[in-house]
């Protein structure tokens, strides 16, 4: 996480700051939805455990043409040590459960707040 930068300040960003910035962006996209987020697109649900940043990115990267989550996708890529491309899936996906992007983001936000409160920045 030493290379996380470019979100709100130049240069490397401490993990706690990077997580806060991700939380703030998720808060922003959950607050400002007058219409269904990403036109109600569905994504694979994930297990919110170790490796969830990559899993979350793998789910969200399959949503195309949705500018509202582009910043979130970029932020998540900073937390994921490997390159993620569309169609890629890890064992963390609950492959039989698809949920709306809006619900996915709300669930992810809730979990990230919990991690932040517990000091789990990595």
């Amino acid at each position: 996480l030493t290379c996380l930068g470019g979100f709100a300040s130049p240069g490397p960003v401490p993990p706690s700051t990077a997580l806060r910035e991700l939380i703030e962006e998720l808060v922003n996209i959950t607050q400002n939805q007058k219409a269904p987020l990403c036109n109600g697109s569905m994504v694979w649900s994930i297990n919110l455990t170790a490796g969830m940043y990559c899993a979350a990115l793998e789910s969200l990267i399959n949503v195309s043409g949705c500018s509202a989550i582009e910043k979130t996708q970029r932020m998540l890529s900073g937390f994921c040590p490997h390159k993620v491309s569309a169609g890629q899936f890890s064992s963390l996906h609950v492959r039989d459960t698809k949920i709306e992007v809006a619900q996915f983001v709300k669930d992810l936000l809730l979990h990230l707040k919990k991690l932040f409160r517990e000091g789990q920045f990595n």
């Epitope: 709100a8 300040s9 806060r20 910035e21 939380i23 703030e24 808060v27 922003n28 959950t30 607050q31 809730l110 707040k113 932040f116 409160r117």
Partner: antibody
């Protein structure tokens, strides 16, 4: 001691402008999201606006959107509320408040500054 | 917007009484709720955060419970300094919204 001190309130005519300030001390101001909350005479509390720690995200109540502008200067440990096109119904005590670092709502409040809009 | 309906709007109680105030949210807000006490001419003071966690320095006679849409603030044994107005605040979704307030008066 953690402290928030508002200033800038006063009497203004309808359609006029006013700029409120909030001076923060006793904590690292740049780490916290900040909010304005108001209370009309004899009424309850109304959330007005918020600004994130880095000024990236800003939110307003519908009742003030387009008329009020929230801003901050982290170098000066200060929060501001520029209020334009003021109406009689904006008459209230305006409180500056700090959002809990861990996203648990508002944990520290200033003493408030009174804004009176009257001709 | 999320509406917060607080009840009762006022109540009369005696020192030593157990007092309960309720807040209902118009939609699920999980635990994103705080309780605040305000005395005349003073700023609000947070008593409870995360629906049920006691703010540091607040007497243990204050407690909060609930999750989702229904929340309760309880004062187990009312003290003279507790006569004030109490508000709930949801911070789950912007615009943040307060309950209308409950005035706790001396019987």
């Amino acid at each position: 001691e953690v402290q928030l001190v508002e200033s800038g309130g006063g009497l203004v005519k309808p359609g006029g402008s006013l700029r409120l300030s909030c001076a923060a001390s006793g904590f690292t101001f740049s780490d916290y999201n900040m909010h304005w909350v108001r209370q009309a005479p004899g009424k309850g509390l109304e959330w007005v606006s918020s600004i994130s720690y880095s000024s990236t995200y800003i939110y307003y109540a519908d009742s003030v959107r387009g008329r009020f502008t929230i801003s901050r200067d982290n170098a000066k440990n200060s929060l501001y509320l520029q209020m334009n096109s003021l109406r009689a119904e904006d008459t209230a005590v305006f409180y500056c408040a700090r959002e809990d670092y861990y996203y648990y709502g508002l944990d520290v409040w200033g003493q408030g500054t009174t804004v009176t809009v009257s001709s | 917007d999320i509406q917060m309906t607080q009840s009762p709007s006022s109540l009369s109680a005696s020192v030593g009484d157990r007092v309960t105030i309720t807040c209902r949210a118009s939609q699920d807000i999980r635990n994103d709720l705080g309780w605040y006490q305000q005395k005349p001419g003073k700023a609000p003071k947070r008593l409870i955060y995360d629906a049920s966690s006691l703010q540091s320095g607040v007497p243990s006679r204050f407690s909060g419970s609930g999750s989702g849409t229904e929340f309760t603030l309880t004062i187990s044994s009312l003290q003279p300094e507790d006569f004030a107005i109490y508000y709930c605040l949801q911070h789950n979704s912007y615009p943040w919204t307060f309950g209308q307030g409950t005035k706790v008066e001396i019987k």
